[in-house]
């Protein structure tokens, strides 16, 4: 769609005559008829296929034609077309004399024609005017013409419709060829896609206007390149949305379970070594001289009452020292210089000689203890209840009230680990945070008290004559209990038969 524009500039008819040569009376009142048609090698009469237009009377005889376009007048003349401009044309311009006011063809005598010019040629669409002048014997016409596209039509032949736009179906202006020129910040075939903030993640971000970066669900950050971890994730990260990958030392669905309590809380005191043993649990290995769950207690080596037979304990820098009562000696006052003849057993304790009278042992009545039955049993003073159990005196007996998670007479068994009695040879089982520990009786060792360590003096069957052999664990010696009729440290002599000596 476009417009052929014809600008009439000057018409000269000095003699004021018609084409026939006859003069106009009083002068030639001149108007023009214009016919625009398809290209013809020889311009001939016929339909004005591209359009036709007429002017009012513009002047008499010779005159200049005023440019009236600014005032909305008829110069230049407009011949609109609603097709693709072919690039070629034929143009006929006729000058007519109007004797009266009626300018219709049928109202004019045929000899009212002043002049007729016909041209044809090529004409490209453009803003520039082509100036032309046509002269006949009696007249001269100066004019210019051009073809321009109608509003919103573009291209070499005005065939491309383009309407500038700034809504969600496009943000563009039109180039001279009719192609779209996107407004800043927009892209796409129809400039309907905003250019997001530079660096905005292609998949995880989007925008509805330029320089914006809106995040899709599960993503965050200025460029939507940071995933959002699982809601409640404490000490973790993600590589895809809603993940919770735990930082080192943390565990659980939300990474809120402390697997490295040692590093995060440093619970062990006094230079102890800390070992993680599960979620929020740890074990402290104390340096010598310290005790307690966190090795927070300074150890007095006398606390374990190492002195026997009433010996008193004295702390020293490098350990302890037992002061023994009369009749006892040894590191722990464990050796006696007394025998049953000295009646060493108090409180009705009965004395048993051992090692052929070189030693003795007291058998204490109920409620008394000590190697000489000298101590009245306060069943709770020895703190028999393990693992924080509470000791309750019940007359001649006592009982332990255990903390949750522990059982056994002395609360010595952890419900879970010690329930299956893992300690052999009467070993005492202690449940620890990270497993269990067996306290072995004398003569046994190993993680489960499975290794016999003392030499069983009876193992070589030293007693004769079906005597019963007893091992003294404190001295690794044996005692033979002779049947009737036999005597001797090994029951090797029948009664009445003195030993035969070699001399």
């Amino acid at each position: 769609s476009g417009v052929f524009q014809l600008q009439l500039q000057e018409f000269i008819n000095e003699r004021g005559v018609l084409a026939s040569g006859r003069p106009c009376e009083p002068g030639c009142r001149t108007f023009f008829r214009v016919c625009l048609k398809h290209f013809q090698a020889v311009v001939s009469p016929g339909p004005c296929t591209f359009g036709t237009v007429s002017t009012p009377v513009l002047g008499t005889n010779s005159f200049a034609v005023r440019d009236d376009s600014s005032g909305g007048g008829r110069n230049p003349l407009q011949l609109p077309f609603n097709f693709t401009w072919p690039g070629t044309f034929s143009l006929i311009i006729e000058a007519w004399h109007a004797p009266g006011d009626d300018l219709r063809p049928e109202a004019l005598p045929p000899d009212a024609l002043i002049s007729k010019i016909a041209i044809q040629g090529s004409l490209a669409v453009g803003q520039n005017w082509l100036l032309d002048e046509q002269t006949s014997t009696l007249t001269r016409l100066r004019y210019s013409y051009r073809v321009i596209c109608s509003d919103n039509y573009y291209g070499d032949n005005c065939s491309r419709l383009c309407k500038k736009r700034n809504d969600h179906f496009g943000h563009y202006v039109c180039q001279p060829d009719g192609n779209l020129s996107c407004l800043p910040g927009w892209t796409g075939e129809y400039c309907q896609q905003p250019i997001c903030l530079s660096g905005c993640h292609e998949q995880n971000g989007y925008c509805s206007k330029p320089a914006e970066c809106l995040c899709r669900p599960g993503w965050q950050g200025r460029l939507c390149n940071e995933c959002i971890p699982h809601n409640g994730c404490r000490h973790g990260t993600c590589s895809t949305p809603w993940q919770c990958t735990c930082d080192e030392g943390w565990g659980g669905l939300f990474c809120d379970q402390d697997l490295n309590y040692c590093t995060h809380h440093s619970p062990c005191k006094n230079g102890a070594t800390c070992s993680n043993s599960g979620q929020r649990s740890y074990t402290c290995t104390c340096r010598p001289g310290y005790t307690g769950v966190d090795c927070e207690l300074e150890l007095s080596e006398c606390d374990s009452n190492p002195c026997r037979n009433g010996g008193s304990c004295k702390d020293q820098e490098d350990g302890y020292h037992c002061l023994c009562p009369p009749g006892y000696y040894g590191l722990h006052c464990e050796h006696s210089t007394l025998s049953c003849a000295d009646s060493p057993c108090f409180n009705g304790g009965s004395c048993r000689e051992r090692n052929q009278g070189a030693n003795y042992a007291c058998e204490c009545p109920p409620n008394f203890t000590g190697s000489n039955c000298e101590k009245k049993v306060d069943r709770c003073t020895s703190n028999p209840c393990a693992n924080g159990g509470q000791c309750l005196n019940r007359g001649p007996s006592r009982m332990c009230r255990c903390r949750p998670g522990f059982t056994g007479t002395y609360c010595e068994l952890h419900v879970s680990d010690c329930a299956r009695n893992p300690c052999a040879h009467g070993g005492t089982c202690h449940d620890l945070e990270n497993g269990l520990m067996c306290t072995c009786p004398a003569g046994f060792s190993g993680r489960r008290c499975e290794v016999r360590t003392s030499i069983d003096a009876c193992a070589s069957s030293p007693c004769f004559n079906r005597a019963t052999c007893y091992t003294d664990l404190s001295t690794d010696t044996f005692v033979c209990n002779c049947p009737y009729g036999f005597v001797g440290s090994r029951c090797e002599f029948p009664v009445g038969l003195p030993p035969s000596f070699p001399w």
Partner: antibody
Framework: EVQLVESGGGLVQPGGSLRLSCAVS??????????WGWIRQAPGKGLEWIGD???????YYNPSLKSRVTISVDTSKNSFYLQMNSLRAEDTAVYYC?????????????WGQGTLVTVSS | EYVLTQSPDFQSVTPKEKVTITCSGQ??????ASWYQQKPDQSPKLVIY???KRPSGVPSRFSGSNSGDDATLTINSLEAEDAATYYC?????????FGQGTKVEIK
């Protein structure tokens, strides 16, 4: 062949709300060439544009309805939705969903069959 | 608020006659006009887009133009199946606007 199917119409009390769905088949709702719109038509009256949405979630609304309308999209279900609140009798209409084509300069080349919403007590 | 006004509201035409419906709006020629045909109890159907283009399947008797303040839908030789209500539509900024409709009836 692209098809749009509306659902969710029916009788609604004045002051209530409606949620209509438009399921798209035969083409992806995530194409950059289309907006997805809602248009309504009161009984015996003309067409009124309600609003539209792009697959990214960008929305545009008729200023006269904007305060009561929300359009959303679920690309995984290839569907988009119209939520309208504070309904009154004059909201009684057949509600259509349509595809608005950027290449057709915003012309709607595919329409749903429409779903009737009646606002009455 | 942008308004599109169609004229006439109603037209009764004999078959083979030419039908012209005008849609007027301020500087409508600077916008793209679309035309929809709606038959009773049916969804609207696009018959003209981008002022004058026809979607495939729309008969060539339908044509459109748009310049100045007016867009025009022309049905060159009306057929019985063309009885319907016709709506013009354009976009003003980001809002879709429809004309009030023109009902075309067969005499």
């Amino acid at each position: 062949e692209v098809q749009l199917v509306e659902s969710g119409g029916g009788l609604v009390q004045p002051g209530g709300s409606l949620r209509l769905s438009c399921a798209v088949s035969g083409g992806s709702i995530s194409s950059s060439s289309y907006y997805w719109g809602w248009i309504r038509q009161a009984p015996g009256k003309g067409l009124e544009w309600i609003g539209d949405i792009y697959y990214t979630g960008s929305t545009y609304y008729n200023p006269s309805l904007k305060s009561r309308v929300t359009i959303s999209v679920d690309t995984s279900k290839n569907s988009f939705y119209l939520q309208m609140n504070s309904l009154r009798a004059e909201d009684t209409a057949v509600y259509y969903c349509a595809r608005e084509d950027v290449i057709l300069r915003g012309g709607s080349d595919y329409w749903g069959q429409g779903t009737l919403v009646t606002v009455s007590s | 608020e942008y308004v599109l006004t169609q004229s006439p509201d109603f037209q009764s035409v004999t078959p083979k006659e030419k039908v012209t419906i005008t849609c007027s709006g301020q500087r409508l020629g600077d916008k793209y006009a679309s035309w929809y045909q709606q038959k009773p109890d049916q969804s609207p159907k696009l018959v003209i887009y981008e002022d004058s283009k026809r979607p495939s399947g729309v008969p060539s008797r339908f044509s459109g133009s748009n310049s100045g303040d007016d867009a025009t839908l022309t049905i060159n030789s009306l057929e019985a199946e063309d009885a319907a209500t016709y709506y013009c539509q354009a976009w003003d900024r980001d809002t879709g606007v429809f004309g009030q409709g023109t009902k075309v009836e067969i005499k």
